[in-house]
């Protein structure tokens, strides 16, 4: 059973994710950001389900491409370069989903817009922290 | 015990610059982001941004996009919030909280714009 | 951005009475939502966190439920050092946004 330091301790951490999936949701959906027609012409996978930390694995598998969409917009609302702060991201699905057991990432039939992937994975931290105690 | 310790009042012209800053202590002040709120004389409160002070990301609330920046210098466990262009509405009680819960507040400051 | 709505805007009570504010959202925010107190001259402090959890050394005649939009945070017995403007915030979408305060008075 989770103790109540490691409960602590993922809230934290998805808490994290959130505010740094909803900066970059924030920064390209920006009014003054000239490529976000272009960057959503870009397909992302979205997970078939994802209402379990160990799905964090889909999230993880797209982490390259949404650094290379992110590299086009070269936006000054991330105050970070796209390297450092997917880089940020990545260590805290690493910890999140952890690497005791391998999961295989299922992805539904459809693609997404960059816009729809943020979106959906900014509603799976909010679900999982919603169902912390 | 986790302590959030701000700088004292300022009082600043208009179109001058402020900066507050904010020491943590009593916790791991990479592992935890900082938040700024203000609050206006007799009115309520309004988030300003957070800054990540292990990566020093910020993310800022689009009212205040341009004017504020937020920094941090994990060698002292302090977080900075300077805000420029200042404005006679800018004359608020700035606090630092941290992370989503605002768990711990710092005691706040208050920065009076007046010509 | 989330707007939340808090009422009343100020209330009047009697020591060992049940007090009751609500807070409602503009749209779905989960159970992501905080309750503060501030008393005059201080900074907030935090009494419950997501909704229904009492934040730890908060006395337990504080409480706080609900999800979705709607909100309630609740006094079960007013006592003297109760009086402050108490806030909804939530944490589920960026901009993080507070209601607009209730102040609580005693009779």
């Known amino acids: 059973a989770p103790t109540s330091s490691s409960t602590k301790k993922t809230q934290l951490q998805l808490e994290h994710l959130l505010l740094d999936l909803q900066m970059i949701l924030n920064g390209i959906n920006n009014y003054k950001n000239p490529k976000l027609t272009r960057m959503l012409t870009f397909k992302f996978y979205m997970p078939k389900k994802a209402t379990e930390l160990k799905h964090l694995q889909c999230l993880e598998e797209e982490l390259k491409p949404l650094e290379e969409v992110l590299n086009l917009a070269q936006s000054k609302n991330f105050h970070l370069r796209p390297r450092d702060l997917i880089s940020n991201i990545n260590v805290i699905v690493l910890e999140l989903k952890g690497s005791e057991t391998t999961f295989m990432c299922e992805y539904a039939d459809e693609t997404a817009t960059i816009v729809e992937f943020l979106n959906r994975w900014i509603t799976f931290c909010q679900s999982i922290i919603s169902t912390l105690t | 015990q986790v302590q959030l310790v701000q700088s004292g009042a300022e009082v600043k012209k208009p179109g001058a610059s402020v900066k507050v800053s904010c020491k943590a202590s009593?916790?791991?002040?990479?592992?935890?982001?900082m938040h700024w709120v203000r609050q206006a004389p007799g009115q309520g409160l309004e988030w300003m941004g957070w800054?990540?002070?292990?990566?020093?990301?910020?993310n800022y609330a689009q009212k205040f996009q341009g004017r504020v920046t937020m920094t941090r210098d994990t060698s002292i466990s302090t977080a900075y919030m300077e805000l420029s262009r200042l404005r006679s509405d800018d004359t608020a009680v700035y606090y630092c909280?941290?992370?989503?819960?605002?768990?711990?507040w710092g005691q706040g400051t208050l920065v009076t714009v007046s010509s | 951005a989330i707007q939340l709505t808090q009422s009343p805007s100020s209330l009047s009570a009697s020591v060992g009475d049940r007090v009751t504010i609500t807070c409602q959202a503009s749209?779905?925010?989960?159970?992501?939502l905080n309750w503060y107190r501030q008393k005059p001259g201080k900074a907030p402090d935090l009494l419950v966190y997501?909704?229904?959890n009492l934040e730890t050394g908060v006395p337990s005649r504080f409480s706080g439920s609900g999800s979705g939009t709607d909100f309630t945070f609740t006094i079960s017995s007013l006592q003297p050092e109760d009086v402050g403007t108490y806030y909804c915030q939530q944490s589920a979408n960026l901009p993080l946004t507070f209601g607009g305060g209730t102040k609580v008075e005693i009779k």
């Open positions: 800054i990540n002070p292990n990566s020093g990301g910020t």
């Open positions: 749209q779905d925010i989960f159970n992501l």
């Open positions: 997501r909704a229904s």
């Open positions: 909280a941290r992370d989503l819960t605002f768990d711990y």
């Open positions: 009593g916790y791991t002040f990479t592992g935890y982001y």
